[in-house]
């Protein structure tokens, strides 16, 4: 008799794929002809693009009125007219809903100022946030983000209160908190009192770009957080290129999409957007490169392969990889909610298996190093439920040159420098 199927876990929408942060709506528009509509209306015109990325939610803003460092002139219920109107926002919500994209609103109060939380007037600000949560939930948003919570006194208790409001409205609403901290103990203390909170941090940003160190960070985090759902990113707001050299972007995309939890990206991560390559652009929010006309400031600064347009037409581009990974992440049970087992594969490598019941299983092998390596996959580290076969089919490599779909012998696996492999193999009873 066939074994009984394992009961599927209850999954919320943010469990099913990536979140996409658009912190600066004006930068996201691009310059030149991309900048024709007010930013919120302009974003509506980009929803088809966002659908093509298969992202499940947009984290927007902040877009509320905020006069730098002036709590009296900060109104979390009013949209800053530079971004558009409440009507524009309502229209965006409706359009996003039709495309099954959720909208999360960033309510970090003093986003233009020195201290995001007006440190001397915490109670006033907390009341404003409470009122804003209720107002925007009624308006139809799907969740909220608050950043820099290390600057918020009594953050844990405020977050618990805001979580209650959010979940009290609907279990289907999400609260995301962001911190600049990379300290696991600080992160755990924030998570302790808030069971459904999604926390973005700089925890992975000091991974030192070695396989062993990354493996140890990931496994420590998963062990410490138990079976709670987590998110994966390199920071609470910044682009991957702020932390990674270009040659590691593909590797990290593969990793973030295949770890157990919600991957969180910033606009431009899908094309390797890099402020350093755009003279005069701010590191934290460079202009999005839709096509060569998006940055007319310096003629010739932008080549086609840096843009959405150029990369969309290249099956070997970072954008094409992002789309493929996002698609896999959103439809494969083992990647959606499967178990995770990391195991030894030799120095410099990080490898793990994702598996769920009798569904297809996935093996990820990542070479963070500058030299090619042979993988010595130590299957003895794995439980019986996650044993390795002799061969697995190559679903994709982060590097060109491999024949996709071909079976690879796991005993003889060799990885190029900075190469990541995603392999698949069937369940065997």
């Amino acid at each position: 008799r066939a074994p009984r199927c394992r009961e599927l876990p209850a999954q919320k929408w943010w469990h099913t794929g990536a979140l996409y942060r658009i912190g600066d709506l004006q930068a996201f528009q691009g310059h030149g002809a991309g900048n024709l509509a007010a930013p919120i209306s302009g974003l509506k015109g980009r929803l088809d693009y966002l659908s093509s990325l298969k992202v499940k939610g947009l984290v927007l803003g902040p877009i509320h009125k905020n006069q730098k460092d002036d709590v009296a002139q900060t109104d979390l219920l009013q949209i800053d007219p530079n971004f558009g109107s409440k009507e524009d926002f309502d229209s965006l919500l409706q359009s996003a809903k039709k495309k099954s994209i959720r909208v999360i609103l960033d309510l970090t109060p003093n986003y233009r100022g020195e201290n995001s939380w007006f440190s001397t007037q915490v109670d006033t600000v907390a009341t404003k946030v409470k009122d804003a949560l209720e107002f925007w939930l009624q308006a139809g948003v799907d969740g909220f983000q608050v950043r820099d919570i290390e600057n918020l006194k009594d953050a844990s208790s405020f977050l618990a209160e805001w979580q209650n409001i959010t979940k009290g409205f609907s279990e289907d609403r999400l609260l995301i908190a962001g911190t600049n901290s990379s300290d696991l103990q600080q992160i755990l203390s924030l998570l302790e009192s808030n069971k459904d909170l999604l926390l973005t941090s700089s925890y992975l940003s000091d991974s030192g770009s070695t396989g062993e160190h990354t493996k140890s960070l990931v496994t420590q985090y998963l062990n410490a957080t138990g079976n709670r759902w987590c998110s994966w990113s390199l920071s609470q707001a910044r682009l991957l290129t702020s932390f990674l050299p270009a040659q590691l972007l593909r590797l990290y995309q593969l990793m973030l999409f295949t770890l157990p939890g919600t991957p969180v990206f910033s606009y431009g991560d899908e094309i390797g957007l890099d402020a350093a390559a755009l003279p005069g652009q701010p590191m934290e929010a460079p202009v999005m490169l839709w096509d060569e006309s998006s940055f007319p400031d310096i003629p010739g600064a932008v080549s086609a392969n840096m843009t959405v347009k150029g990369q969309s037409e290249d099956p070997g581009s970072l954008l094409s990889l992002f789309r493929r990974l996002s698609d896999q992440r959103s439809k494969e049970r083992s990647l959606l909610h499967g178990d995770f087992h990391a195991f030894s594969a030799g120095p410099g490598l990080f490898s793990y298996i994702r598996h769920w019941d009798q569904n297809e299983r996935f093996l990820v092998v990542l070479n963070f190093g500058d030299v090619g390596l042979s993988a010595g996959l130590q299957a003895s580290d794995l439980p019986a439920s996650a044993s390795l076969p002799a061969k697995a089919d190559l679903l994709l490599s982060t590097q060109p040159g491999r024949e996709e779909g071909s079976p690879l012998e796991l005993e003889r696996l060799k990885l190029e420098p900075h190469e990541g492999l995603l392999l698949r193999f069937p369940y065997a009873a």
């Epitope: 030149g32 007010a38 509506k44 009507e87 359009s95 096509d291 006309s293 969309s312």
Partner: antibody
């Protein structure tokens, strides 16, 4: 409902000027880029000019550059086209429209046209 | 500038017919193509955006397809109100926006 109404057309001699207006209602005019498109008698559609939501970016087709100026007054929900040094080949019905932005992967569902105003340039 | 060429320039058909109009771009425009319908003395009406997405309120007998340089507009079963001129328009990147020269669809 969403509406655009053009006015200001008429018969004018070559070399003279004319100012077209387009009054918008039923949508947040100040949030959208706006275009002028023309259609010569018995001919197809020709894009003329566009202006961004805040007036900071303007673009023109080559044949009108230096002669036509697009502008807007968001407080009055009105779009303008100042046409100087008019030529016989400028004779057309002029439509104002909201067509979205001409950049890669931008798709606007906000596509509204006025009924047009007729400009005839003749001596 | 990107040139748009429609064919045929005019076309006679009967109510109930299936009709196809093609539009070719002088260079690849991905799927950045819109279709409009215009009746005499009226403003153009937006039918299809992004090559194949139907604008709300447009009857499902209209459909669009194609990407790159070759596009088609199909009317699956012509109705009396469909006799008009049809224009394709590219909005691929950077002005100018360009239209095809139009296809006049008349009753046979």
């Amino acid at each position: 409902q969403v509406q655009l109404v053009e006015s200001g057309g008429g018969v004018v001699q070559p070399g003279r000027s004319l100012r077209l207006s387009c009054a918008a209602s039923g949508f947040t005019f100040s949030s959208y880029g706006m275009h002028w498109v023309r259609q010569a008698p018995g001919k197809g559609l020709e894009w003329v000019a566009l202006i961004s939501y805040d007036g900071s970016n303007k673009y023109y087709t080559d044949s009108v550059k230096g002669r036509f100026t697009i502008s807007r007054d968001n407080s009055k929900n009105t779009l303008y086209l100042q046409m100087n040094s008019l030529r016989a080949e400028d004779t057309a019905v002029y439509f104002c429209a909201s067509l979205g932005a001409p950049t890669y992967s931008y798709f606007s569902d906000m596509d509204v046209w006025g009924l047009g105003t007729t400009v005839t340039v003749s001596s | 500038d990107i040139q748009m060429t429609q064919s045929p320039s005019s076309l006679s058909a009967s109510v109930g017919d299936r009709v196809t109009i093609t539009c070719r771009a002088s260079q690849s425009i991905s799927s950045s193509l819109n279709w409009y319908q215009q009746k005499p003395g009226k403003a153009p009406k937006f039918l299809i955006y992004a090559a194949s997405s139907l604008q709300s309120g447009v009857p499902s007998r209209f459909s669009g397809s194609g990407s790159g340089t070759d596009f088609t507009l199909t009317i699956s079963s012509l109705q009396p109100e469909d006799f008009a001129t049809y224009y394709c328009q590219q909005s691929y990147s950077t002005p100018p926006i360009t239209f095809g020269q139009g296809t006049r669809l008349e009753i046979k």
